[in-house]
């Protein structure tokens, strides 16, 4: 083993000292004879020491001893001691007691042999072992007077060699992280939690991070264990953006031919069944009714026009029932109903006319008479010298129950080229021209059009009481929706519990997977805010898709175009959710088509209005929007504009 130079010399010096020892003792005896027992001169002292440095050191001090104790001849013991100590420069010891191993007397000098860790002439200077190669320590070197020691950083312990360090595995202690996962790290450890949770060192547990406090969402934020979801005001036409935090407009992804014809009159605008047009004709000259117009519809039932006086006098109503023209008339209190002619709800234009002749009424379709009814009286009724006639289009001026035979007055139909009493009609034309809601779509197909701005609702019952009385009633919700969407987000079908302001069930289009936070076009089936099943759909392809939903005790399925959707809940969760749904179904619920009422955005996965074509079948019964308890006036019940042809 090689030692540093200084240490080597320190190691060797004691050996040298031992070699001089015999010589030193002889010198001491010689000094006794020459200068203690006798008075010696400098030259005699030189003979004792045999060198000048020691002599030069000794002689002045020798004279001091004489001065102090008297000459040798006085035989003062103090003198002998004084002189005997002079040649030993280590007496008194000039070296630092703590740092010196030995003091070596030299010729007029001395040498302090230092202990390990000390240095300097007097061995009073601490050697900083840490300054060179960290004192051989792997991590921390602690210098201290005459020594040093190694130590380790927190999380490490000193090895048996006193110099190297080894990592402490804190995770070996099961209590290190409490409920959290423990991960050992070099010199440390980390308590890990799942995403969305943060470690609480006080509780030694993972606690949910409330991301909503961080203001991550643009609109509504809902915190959940380990996660959060942002919601946008769907009813306001907004949906989540790509970043799943901000909101953006729900824009049509399929262009529909929604252009309107300014020369047409839409009859289905007023859901209340009240007329879209009310005209009053007054004449001094007795006049007969003549009405002619072009008409187009897919609707099987509704009122085209009313002409006459008040409900108890004389009037006629031209209507559609089962797709055929029906004429209801009341003359002087006597009512009749006549139906004849071809099915005309085929969606193509045809010319219809009503003409009052001397003793009969003639109804024509495309100039062919389909009805000729004998009547006794005139529709224009005299009053205070003037003849009066009220004419209403698309409804009647009294309640439909007061008709000869009740009928649903709502008619999704279109009129053009109308002519009332052979007169030019600038009034209606001017009104229609400035009011697009009074105009019809230029082109329509079968179906119902939801414009993305409203809904319809029905009061339907989903509980079924079995024939054998006394047994528990069962429930069933089966929905078949034929859809041709124009936008990627919107409620197709939903149940709403008004008393609880909850959404027990919803089927909707959505463009993201909320838990995976992934943009994807899906159909979602949900009970309240919990998604039960999801299924991918090519929503913006302009094609018709069939969405089928079936829920009954113990099962829930979602299918899109015959392919079954993915369940999003466990079997136990499904049962719990279906139990919630059943509880709702036992109370009054309303059935919504195309949207939801003003509910909190967190009530259901989607709250936006549906935009596009859709027909709904609920529990094997086709829903007729004319039969709804309420329908937004912009929803067309029996017609839908086609998808715009792709630009060449």
């Amino acid at each position: 083993a090689l030692l540093p130079a200084r240490e080597a010399t320190q190691f060797l010096r004691p050996r040298q000292r031992r070699a001089f020892q015999v010589f030193e003792e002889a010198k001491q005896g010689h000094l006794e004879r020459e200068c203690v027992e006798e008075l010696c001169s400098r030259e005699e002292a030189r003979e004792v020491f045999e060198n000048d440095p020691e002599t030069d050191y000794f002689y002045p001090r020798y004279l001091d001893c004489i001065n102090k104790y008297g000459s040798p001849y006085t035989k003062n013991s103090g003198f002998a001691t004084c002189v005997q100590n002079l040649p030993d420069q280590c007496t008194p010891n000039p070296c630092d007691r703590k740092g010196t191993q030995a003091c070596q007397d030299l010729m007029g000098n001395f040498f302090c042999l230092c202990k390990a860790g000390w240095g300097g002439r007097l061995c009073d200077k601490d050697v900083n072992e840490c300054s060179q190669e960290n004192g051989g320590c792997l991590q921390i070197c602690h210098n201290k007077p005459g020594s040093f020691h190694c130590s380790c950083h927190s999380g490490f312990e000193l090895s048996s060699d006193g110099r190297t360090c080894q990592d402490i595995d804190e995770c070996a202690d099961s209590e290190a992280c409490g409920e959290a996962r423990c991960k050992n790290l070099p010199g440390s450890y980390s308590c890990l939690c799942d995403e969305g949770f943060a470690y609480s060192s006080q509780e030694k547990a993972c606690r949910d991070v409330d991301e909503c406090l961080q203001g991550r969402c643009e609109q509504v934020c809902v915190n959940s264990p380990g996660s959060y979801t942002c919601h946008c005001d769907g009813r306001g036409g907004l949906k989540l953006s790509q970043d799943m935090d901000t909101c953006e407009d729900i824009l049509p992804c399929v262009p529909f031919s929604v252009a309107k014809s300014v020369k047409s009159l839409y009859l289905g605008r007023m859901f209340s069944g009240t007329p879209v047009i009310r005209l009053r004709f007054k004449r001094l000259q007795p006049t007969r009714l003549v009405a002619e117009f072009d008409f187009r519809t897919f609707d099987p039932e509704g009122i085209l026009l009313f002409a006459g006086g008040h409900q108890d006098s004389t009037w006629i109503v031209l209507a559609l029932r089962a797709g055929r023209l029906e004429l209801q008339l009341r003359y002087n209190g006597v009512g009749r109903v006549t139906s004849s002619g071809p099915v005309i709800n085929h969606g193509m234009w045809q010319t219809i006319s009503v003409e009052e002749l001397a003793r009969n009424l003639v109804i024509k379709v495309n100039r062919d008479a389909v009805m000729k009814i004998a009547v006794a009286g005139d529709l224009f009724q005299p009053e205070r010298g003037l003849y009066h006639l009220n004419l209403t289009v698309g409804g009647i001026p009294f309640h439909e129950k007061d008709l000869v035979q009740p009928i649903n007055p709502r008619l999704d139909g279109c009129m053009r080229s109308w002519n009332w009493l052979n007169g030019e009609d600038t009034t209606i034309q001017e009104t229609v021209k400035v009011n697009t809601r009074m105009q019809c779509f230029s082109v329509t197909e079968r179906g119902s059009f939801y414009p993305g701005s409203g809904f319809a609702f029905y009061s339907l019952d989903y509980m079924r009481t079995p024939l054998d009385v006394g047994t528990e009633s069962t429930w069933e919700v089966e929905v078949v929706a034929h859809i041709r969407p124009a936008a990627d987000t919107g409620v197709l079908f939903a149940l709403w519990a008004p008393d609880l302001r909850a959404v027990p069930l919803s089927v909707a289009l959505v463009d993201y997977h909320s838990t995976k936070k992934l943009k994807k076009q899906l159909v979602v089936l949900a009970v309240e805010h919990t998604a039960l099943a999801l299924m991918e759909i090519k929503v913006c392809d302009g094609q018709e898709h069939v969405v089928t939903v079936s829920l009954r005790d113990g099962e829930a399925t979602l299918e899109v175009d015959g392919t079954r959707g993915q369940s999003e809940v466990s079997a136990a969760q499904l049962q719990e959710r279906l139990a919630v749904l059943e509880r709702h179904l036992r109370s009054p619920v309303l059935t919504f088509a195309g949207g939801l009422p003003d509910v909190p955005v967190t009530s259901a996965p989607v709250t936006a209005f549906y935009r596009g074509c859709m027909t709904l079948e609920v529990n094997r019964r086709l829903l007729d929007l004319d039969e709804a308890a309420y329908k937004h006036s912009d929803i067309t019940a029996h017609s839908c504009p086609p998808v715009e042809p792709a630009a060449a």
Epitope: F281, R283, L284, Q285, R384, G423, E424
Partner: antibody, heavy 116, light 107 residues
């Protein structure tokens, strides 16, 4: 387009007669009655009555019974107003107006001046 | 016979002013009131027909209100072309009767 065009101004002496015309176009003449309205200089409007264009039967208000006669020629879709034994107070503008219970379409008016 | 009392007989207004003309009938005529505008040397023009209905092409500054026996015709902000004489006409019963007229002049 409905048009009612009246004959030109007339200057007559008291005791004379005058017959003014109102030619209708742009609609079926017999579907609407024809009204006559008088407006004396600086005065308001007075309804004189009307004629049934189907039957030719006239109806006069009390004030205009006697010297005033409404007539028709359906072949030329024209209605006439004749005033006999003219008086100075007959000086007025006479308007024809199509019957719609109220008056939407008017002739431009014919000024009849009775002056000696 | 239903008589109509129209007031005022004349009024002077500035452009932009609101004008209100009333017509009171001697019998209840429901809402069978009509309002006409007449300019010198011209035939009257129908502005408002029965049921307080604004006729096609008539500016929306003109309006009619009332039913029964009390009727009001309003010009919300008079324009230079509105200076004329205005008449009410009842078409509830024969004989048809006009109001005496209201002349709206420039102040």
């Amino acid at each position: 387009q409905v048009h009612l065009v009246q004959s030109g101004s007339e200057l007559k002496k008291p005791g004379a007669s005058v017959k003014i015309s109102c030619k209708a176009s742009g609609y079926t003449f017999t579907n609407y009655g024809m009204n006559w309205v008088r407006q004396a200089p600086g005065q308001g409007l007075e309804w004189m009555g009307w004629i049934n264009t189907n039957t030719g039967e006239p109806t006069y208000t009390e004030e205009f019974k006697g010297r005033f006669v409404f007539s028709l020629d359906t072949s030329v879709t024209t209605s006439y107003l004749q005033i006999s034994t003219l008086k100075a107070e007959d000086t007025a503008v006479y308007f024809c107006a199509r019957d719609e219970g109220w008056f939407v379409y008017w002739g431009q008016g014919t000024l009849v001046t009775v002056s000696s | 016979e239903t008589t109509l009392t129209q007031s005022p007989s004349s009024l002077s207004v500035s452009t932009g002013d609101r004008v209100t003309i009333t017509c009171i009938t001697s019998t209840d005529i429901d809402d069978d009131m009509n309002w006409y505008q007449q300019k010198p040397g011209k035939a009257p023009k129908l502005l408002i027909s029965e049921g307080n209905t604004l006729r096609p092409g008539v500016p929306s500054r003109f309006s009619g209100s009332g039913s029964g026996t009390d009727f009001t015709f309003t010009i919300s902000s008079t324009q230079p072309e509105d200076f004329a004489t205005y008449y009410c006409l009842q078409t509830d019963s024969v004989p048809l009767t006009f109001g005496q007229g209201t002349k709206v002049e420039i102040k």
